[in-house]
Amino acid sequence: LTCLGGFASPGPVPPSTALRELIEELVNITQNQKAPLCNGSMVWSINLTAGMYCAALESLINVSGCSAIEKTQRMLSGFCPHKVSAGQFSSLHVRDTKIEVAQFVKDLLLHLKKLFREGQFN
């Protein structure tokens, strides 16, 4: 039974692991960026730090047809407790303020690295 334990289905991914994987994905995007990310698409900026994962997803989910950020969108959905669909507008967004997807991803990476260092995995 001890040996067979290794074949058991894995439990949920620890939050620290999920955050680290999201950071690694964002690093990949920023480092491998050659042409303008998502053809220079613009997304809503964010003006607060609370509820950030859902707000980030609400911004990025409005970018369609950009394979480079599809994995990021999926990963962010794992951090957001509610269903997010295109067109949603959170109070966390700066209304009438849009920034380039590339800058959004770069800033998201900065913020998540800070959270990781501070041990804030959720």
């Epitope: 900026s45 964010i46 800058q103 770069k106 900065l110």
Partner: nanobody, 118 residues
Framework: GVQLLESGGGLVQPGGSLRLSCAAS????????MGWVRQAPGKGLEWVSA????????YYADSVKGRFTISRDNSKNTLYLQMNSLRAEDTAVYYC???????????WGQGTLVTVSS
């Protein structure tokens, strides 16, 4: 792209006050530590003050401690520097800048001139 636009500089008498503002755009201001740096005529850059992204922690150079107050409004994407009890030695161009250790996150404004003179 990223823009930092300072305003509020000008001529003020010794002992007077000024409030500098820095309007940020093109990046997620709320997630950045920010600061003010100044350059007096013919001198090098001098760090003045910094504030953490959430606004809880503030830092000051000894030369301005007790006289200057840094603050931010993340809902308005704006950084402030309230300068009281101004002295002639505070005369400088004041720059708003991001204050991040990470390479590639270094953004600066064009600066605003503060002249303290009678």
């Amino acid at each position: 792209g990223v823009q930092l636009l300072e305003s509020g500089g000008g001529l003020v008498q010794p002992g007077g006050s000024l409030r500098l503002s820095c309007a940020a755009s093109g990046f997620i201001f709320a997630w950045y530590d920010m600061g003010w740096v100044r350059q007096a005529p013919g001198k090098g850059l001098e760090w003045v003050s910094a504030i953490a992204a959430k606004g809880m922690e503030t830092y000051y150079a000894d030369s301005v401690k007790g006289r200057f107050t840094i603050s931010r409004d993340n809902s308005k994407n704006t950084l402030y520097l309230q300068m009281n009890s101004l002295r002639a030695e505070d005369t400088a161009v004041y720059y708003c800048a991001t204050a991040e250790d990470e390479p590639g996150y270094d953004y600066w404004g064009q600066g605003t001139l503060v002249t303290v003179s009678s």
